[in-house]
Amino acid sequence: TPTTLASHSTKTDASSTHHSSVPPLTSSNHSTSPQLSTGVSFFFLSFHISNLQFNSSLEDPSTDYYQELQRDISEMFLQIYKQGGFLGLSNIKFRPGSVVVQLTLAFREGTINVHDVETQFNQYKTEAASRYNLTISDVSVSDVPFPFSAQSGAGVPG
């Protein structure tokens, strides 16, 4: 299983904030030096950006609005989870409700738990407001049980 911790979710309310045009998502801990084989822990994260308006552009990955917001959020998570275990995010999507962001975070197995994912994200809210002009609230984090490192059995592991 992706994590040894019990699967649970946490939810908090608070504010913090969007926008900049930064080149996307590479940092020193996101370096391209080869890494050892390891398991991966996945965490589902949902939050509101209350100072942005949802429109149909956020349903289309080819639009500038979608790509700029994804780039900002990707860069933001690199800043939040600077420790070596953060791999990146996955399957980001945007929903109505100002803008609701839903995504999956990937970490090297054993480097973080669901509580710390949420705590570190909440601690970054003020900086998110000043650096990216993103007002963040309604944060929810949960484990995603998925046997990423299991390679035996009758399935067809890729």
């Epitope: 391209t32 996945f42 999507k93």
Partner: antibody, heavy 118, light 107 residues
């Protein structure tokens, strides 16, 4: 332990609708963040991502095929379905499903070969 | 859609050779690139994700590197069992796209 198996008609004629089923075990599509993608590969050629369905029934499609694709799921039966309308010979391929908690694919089904032939 | 241009298409090799495959993205994808191996009649197998992370059980002769638009996949010492087709994939944004493949062949 994750397993996946695709099934389809094998052979169908041009202009017909292709219906594919992905049956899986080892994960649940009711889990937040989970999803399943369909990917296809014409014989001897490259891979083409087709569609993705999320746990909450949100859907994504390849823009080049969007008007012909329809993805759906039956969470309780651990199945995901893909329909492709108005098929022609260019749709002849092996069709794979893969779970997508990540946007890369550590697990694939064995694939099902679909041949479109008059 | 992001185009992944993969080269070369064919790569003649001998056992023990060091081989390199490159993939170039039509726009920046950060380090969101995966590499797969596919043998005839089999499904693709994940080797590398996030540009440089080896999947569980993948031998350390397989490595990946790169960021932004330019990515490299290397086999440090080719073994007979490595003869296969290799694909890159950008997993940054929908629609996920793959390179056209590189086939390793006996020299």
């Amino acid at each position: 332990q994750i397993t996946l198996k695709e099934s389809g008609p094998g052979i169908l004629q041009p202009s017909q609708t292709l219906s594919l089923t992905c049956s899986f075990s080892g994960f649940s599509l009711s889990t937040s963040g989970m999803g399943v993608s369909w990917i296809r590969q014409p014989s001897g050629k490259g891979l083409e991502w087709l569609s993705h369905i999320y746990w909450d029934d949100d859907k994504r499609y390849n823009p080049s095929l969007k008007s012909r694709l329809s993805i759906s799921k039956d969470t309780s039966r651990n199945q995901v379905f893909l329909k492709i309308t108005s098929v022609d010979t260019a749709d002849t391929a092996t069709y794979y499903c893969a779970p997508g908690v990540s946007s890369w694919f550590p697990y694939w089904g064995p694939g099902t070969l679909v041949t479109v032939s008059a | 859609s992001i185009v992944m241009t993969q080269t070369p298409k064919f790569l003649p090799v001998s056992a023990g050779d060091r081989v390199t495959v490159t993939c170039k993205a039509s726009q920046s994808v950060g380090n969101y690139v995966a590499w797969y191996q596919q043998k005839p009649g089999q499904s693709p197998k994940l080797l590398i994700y996030f540009a440089s992370n080896r999947y569980s059980g993948v031998p350390d002769r397989f490595t990946g590197s790169g960021s932004g638009t330019d990515f490299t996949f290397t086999i440090s010492s080719v073994q007979v069992e490595d003869l296969a087709v290799y694909f890159c994939q950008q997993h940054y944004i929908f629609p996920y796209t793959f390179g056209s493949g590189t086939k390793l062949e006996i020299k």
